[in-house]
């Protein structure tokens, strides 16, 4: 399906507010420094450039690659070199190679201010005055802090952080309609983002086969009706979707993401009955609606798997014809049988089930070799189901902030070499699993909870990844997609880490404490516990309660008191004292 | 070693009801669907209901209405509840359980609907 005129093609599939959206976010992503009216004179330069494409698709240029269009106009910033260093030396490239080098130079955490939320009036006002802008700058400021955010999916939130301004600006009260919303919006946007940076991880370090597996396995478990042929072509277009928008091809990736949702629709038959009301929607709100779609219910006699996987006498004939078919239908069965099962425990069972069919078809007797492989899944299933057990249970008896705190001690003494804010942002993030799961029924616990930690993790792997200072890290983080959370959970206290020295000014804290909202406090308070095991990793749990329990009444006295910095003063020295005693 | 024993059969009037119970002994990990099967002389095994391990339930037309099908997980125990039993409901019923490992069957109670 080739076009004389990419740029012109994606133009006139797209919409001319979609191709700027994502031109906008493209850009922001890749140059995350620069500031907002740059980009938009480049979208707006694009843009032109591509309508006269439209116009003529033989016009001079119009025949070049998007990522030569894209990234010419990349290399024009003045400010590259003083702003983005030697991200610089990337336009000395040619393509892919120019394309390749800015995709390495995106940075997952930007030093870049925290969004501060003005008044709701002069956000209204704003919004009012001029909308487009106020769109643009929406999917600017995201992007350029997310650099890996599902672009298509940003549009959506765009339109639903449009649509919030539009109703709650005409509310009487402005600001108790249009906050939650905002808070909703936020918290959604965050979840999007870290879990599109797994499937982007999961591509770029791992290949695309491991993509794949999860695509089958998670497709399976959510139409289990459907055919492994059906779900083996949705598993090909949705790898050649994200595969698009990890590259940074994100015309491509969201014109080829409406191709799917129109397949998908067409075929609802054959794929799920599910589907129905996600297809009445408009394109955006139909995308996601389909990519967040409950599981249809399980076919009610699906046979047992032993009769074709174990007691076949065609099992390595089979396999040695075409292993990853096999292996890929193997892992339908089984997911379409289990969505009670996390995606990540399937391709721990299928990887099982590989790894016994290489050892066992090369065997004298293969079929007594294999007989009791389903045998030996049993300890990987009852692993994470027990570890869901257990948390649950810590959770249900502390509490959300409380547990935060004992997953903080937990990793800091697994990792302590790894910075405290990172500490802190995973393990508030890994302590979020209990809200999110714990409360649901049985069957939708573990995945919930496992793939929801599978991204967390990812989250640390990537941060470490940029500033490498723990080899237990990477080493969870490379060798096994499937097994990084098995990894991190199996880590203990690391005997080789050489406590760090004792800093009074880590410990020192002043009245601007007590204005800060209850969720930084709790940073506040979480960052110095991460301090303090790191400064004693032995330290017992009683121990570390008590000084938390200390502090806790320490913010709280000063906070009273008429002279609060006063109070911070002549009170801090005293809890540092009596914490080094109750650490000794 | 995987037991099912079934129980709660036995003779009942048309429009009678009777609960039948399967309760399971051994370990079995790994239940994607539980179910109640039917045989009368001379004929297939047929589904009657089952539940499957996202809680979703299916039931034959035949007895759709009438019958329900229930778990309790802490006992390990399968249930079918039978209203409104009609002479054409008398057969041997069998309880299932499946794991992707196996398929585990108990050895039947006699249903007999007659006046």
């Known amino acids: 399906d080739t076009h004389k005129s990419e740029v012109a093609h994606r133009f006139k599939d797209l919409g001319e507010e979609h191709f700027k959206g994502l031109v906008l976010v493209a850009f922001s992503q890749y140059l995350q420094q620069c500031p907002f009216e740059e980009h938009v004179k480049l979208v707006n330069e694009v843009t032109e450039f591509a309508k006269t494409c439209v116009a003529d698709e033989s016009a001079e240029n119009c025949d070049k690659s998007l990522h030569t269009l894209f990234g010419d106009k990349l290399c024009t910033v003045a400010t590259l070199r003083e702003t983005y260093g030697e991200m610089a030396d990337c336009c000395a490239k040619q393509e892919p190679e120019r394309n390749e080098c800015f995709l390495q130079h995106k940075d997952d955490n930007p030093n870049l201010p925290p969004l501060v939320r003005p008044e709701v009036d002069v956000m209204c006002t704003a919004f009012h005055d001029n909308e487009a802008t106020f769109l643009k700058k929406y999917l600017y400021e995201v992007a350029r802090r997310h650099p890996y955010f599902y672009a298509p999916e940003l549009l959506f939130f765009a339109a639903r952080y449009k649509a919030a301004f539009a109703e709650c600006c005409q509310a009487a009260d402005k600001a108790a309609c249009l906050l939650p919303k905002l808070d909703e919006l936020r918290d959604e946007g965050k979840a999007s983002s870290a879990k599109q940076r797994l499937k982007c991880a999961s591509l770029q370090k791992f290949g695309d086969r491991a993509f794949k597996a999860w695509a089958v396995a998670r497709l399976s478990q959510k139409f289990p009706k459907a055919e492994f042929a059906e779900v083996s072509k949705l598993v090909t277009d949705l790898t050649k979707v994200h595969t698009e928008c990890c590259h940074g091809d994100l015309l491509e990736c969201a014109d080829d993401r409406a191709d799917l949702a129109k397949y998908m629709c067409e075929n609802q038959d054959s794929i799920s009955s599910k589907l129905k009301e996600c297809c009445d929607k408009p394109l955006l709100e139909k995308s996601h609606c389909l990519a967040e779609v409950e599981n249809d219910e399980m076919p009610a006699d699906l046979p047992s798997l032993a009769a074709d996987y174990v007691e076949s006498k065609d099992v390595c004939k089979n396999y040695a014809e075409a292993k990853d078919v096999f292996l890929g239908m193997f892992l339908y069965e089984y997911a379409r049988r289990h969505p009670d099962y996390s995606v990540m425990l399937l391709l721990r069972l299928a990887k099982a089930y590989e790894a016994t069919l290489e050892k066992c078809c090369a065997a004298a007797d293969p079929h007594e070799c294999y007989a009791k492989v389903f045998d030996e899944f049993q300890p990987l299933v009852e692993e994470p189901q027990n570890l869901v057990k257990q948390n649950c249970e810590l959770f249900e008896q502390l509490g959300e902030y409380k547990f935060q705190n004992a997953l903080l001690v937990r990793y800091t003494k697994k990792v302590p070499q790894v910075s405290t804010p990172t500490l802190v942002e995973v393990s508030r993030n890994l302590g979020k699993v209990g809200a999110k799961c714990c409360k649901l029924p049985e069957a939708k616990r573990m995945p919930c909870a496992e793939d929801y930690l599978s991204v967390v993790l990812n989250r640390l792997c990537v941060l470490h990844e940029k500033t490498p200072v723990s080899e237990k890290v990477t080493k969870c983080c490379t060798e096994s997609l499937v097994n990084r959370r098995p990894c991190f959970s199996a880590l203990e206290l690391d005997e080789a880490y050489v406590p760090k020295a004792f800093n009074a000014e880590t410990f020192t804290f002043h009245a601007d404490m007590c204005t800060l909202s209850e969720k930084e406090k709790q940073v506040k308070k979480q960052t110095a516990l991460v301090e303090l095991v790191k400064h004693k990793p032995k330290a017992t749990k009683e121990q570390l309660k008590g000084v938390m329990d200390n502090f806790a009444a320490f913010v709280e006295k000063c906070c009273k008191a008429d002279d609060k910095e006063a109070c911070f003063a002549e009170e801090g020295p005293k809890f540092v004292a009596a914490s080094q005693a109750a650490l000794a | 070693q995987v037991q099912l024993v079934e129980s709660g059969g036995g003779l009942v009037q048309p429009g009678g009801s009777l609960r039948l119970s399967c309760s399971a002994s051994?370990?079995?990990?790994?239940?994607?669907?539980m179910g109640w099967y039917r045989q009368a002389p001379g004929k297939q095994r047929e589904l009657v209901a089952s539940?499957?391990?996202?809680?979703?339930?299916h039931y034959a037309d035949t007895v759709k209405g009438r019958f329900t099908i229930s778990r309790d997980n802490s006992k390990n125990t399968l249930y079918l509840q039978m209203n409104s039993l009609e002479p054409e409901d008398t057969a041997v019923y069998y309880c299932?359980?499946?794991?992707?490992?196996?398929?585990?069957w108990g050895q039947g109670t006699q249903v007999t609907v007659s006046s």
């Open positions: 539940i499957t391990v996202d809680g979703s339930t």
């Open positions: 051994g370990s079995i990990w790994g239940i994607y669907h």
């Open positions: 299932d359980i499946r794991n992707v490992g196996g398929d585990y």
